[in-house]
Amino acid sequence: SAHAHPRDSCPLGPGRCCHLETVQATLEDLGWSDWVLSPRQLQLSMCVGECPHLYRSANTHAQIKARLHGLQPDKVPAPCCVPSSYTPVVLMHRTDSGVSLQTYDDLVARGCHCA
Amino acid sequence: SAHAHPRDSCPLGPGRCCHLETVQATLEDLGWSDWVLSPRQLQLSMCVGECPHLYRSANTHAQIKARLHGLQPDKVPAPCCVPSSYTPVVLMHRTDSGVSLQTYDDLVARGCHCA
């Protein structure tokens, strides 16, 4: 079939391949200090690491990309580590009328894959 | 709001930023010559190019990633160019009982963004 088996073990060594990592950031880092009130320190889950051949392939396209990158590395980029899903985060922020809570569905990664 | 305005003009010059590009590939390139019969030459649309700050940001997460990459480039990778959508492709392939047509929904990119 079109789907080769994606690899789940990292051939580059522990922590080197595509995975979820928590990055601390302040509202100032994000340029949000004028409108977000809480949390003032965010724990952002982001996708980092390399995507060696067939590691956590997102889909058939990513598998093709990995294969063609091996053949034509100057023309076809390697797959890269991006979110496969997101988890909701609630922010308290200023509004014209006071304070409001809002849920953001695409702010923080929940899982990662190579696309 | 959390959503800064994604940029649509490439600051790096024509063709340098994240875009859709057609890559020619044979069945041999893909390792599919044993089971795919047609087409024998595929025109694969893939996402290539760089993702400078806020260029075609996929979502809030990508905007945050771009910002934090500017602050902590060793810790947070830049967003990268990946498919935002796919277009279906039909392949004719061998089966135990003969020949069959199958539609693949995730084989060829239709659009790109920075995630």
Epitope: D34, L37, P39, R40, M92 | -
Partner: antibody
């Protein structure tokens, strides 16, 4: 509706450990922090620490260093707090509460678990 | 740690009277745009605390408008404009400006 459910009571012997639960429902568990607050009989409120269910990261008051361990199980939307080496000083009501972050008001509280440490 | 001091420790009033209670912090709780990280809670006997006021002056959902928070920096006040019998409780202030979060000792409100 949005709620945090805690067991009503725990009776534990001195020197032992206890693991209290706080089950969230009616909202996205990973979107809010869980805080733990202690209240000794007839006394005021004392903040113990927080747990971010999304990342598993925790922070607690220095006073509870070595005493408290906060964990969570996202599959069951449950936060846990384990207290070790129990003494009579640990006899109290323990509340879990949710907040938007480490620095936000606690808008929903559990009913509290009454811990009695006695031989 | 930020120390929160509440006064008085108790007070007794008749229904319909106006009540004010004070909360003082050992350092400023003021952040940007005039927001103070100071909240007020009401705890009735045998119940968990309930959020009344957050960020110094914002009433929580469902809280009657007879409850008002005010103040800035280090000095804060909770006012009940017309006390009702059901307001019998202990009132706590709490700062979340920095970790560790700390509570005041509470003000016990009794109804004559």
């Amino acid at each position: 509706q949005v709620q945090l459910q805690q067991p009503g009571a725990e009776l534990v012997k001195p020197g032992a450990s206890v693991k209290m639960s706080c089950k969230a429902s009616g909202y996205p568990f990973e979107g809010w922090y869980i805080h733990w607050v202690k209240q000794r009989p007839g006394q005021g409120l004392e903040w113990m620490g927080w747990n971010n269910p999304r990342t598993g990261l925790t922070n607690h008051a220095q006073k509870f260093q070595g005493k408290v361990t906060m964990t969570r199980d996202t599959s069951s939307s449950t936060a846990y707090m384990q207290l070790s080496s129990l003494t009579s000083e640990d006899s109290a009501v323990y509340y879990c509460a949710r907040g938007v972050g480490a620095d936000a008001a606690f808008d929903i509280w559990g009913q509290g678990t009454t811990l009695t440490v006695s031989s | 740690d930020i120390v929160m001091t509440q006064s008085p420790s108790s007070l007794s009033v008749s229904a319909g009277e106006k009540v004010t209670m004070s909360c003082r912090s050992s350092q400023s709780l003021l952040w940007k745009h005039g927001y103070n990280y100071l909240d007020w809670y009401q705890q009735k006997p045998g119940q968990p605390p309930k959020l009344l006021i957050y960020l110094d002056r914002n009433r929580a959902h469902g809280v009657p408008d007879r409850f008002t928070g005010s103040g800035s920096g280090t000095d804060f006040t909770l006012t009940i404009s017309s006390v009702q019998a059901e307001d019998l409780a202990v009132y706590y202030c709490m700062q979340s400006f920095e970790t560790p979060i700390t509570f005041g000792g509470g003000t016990k409100l009794e109804i004559k």
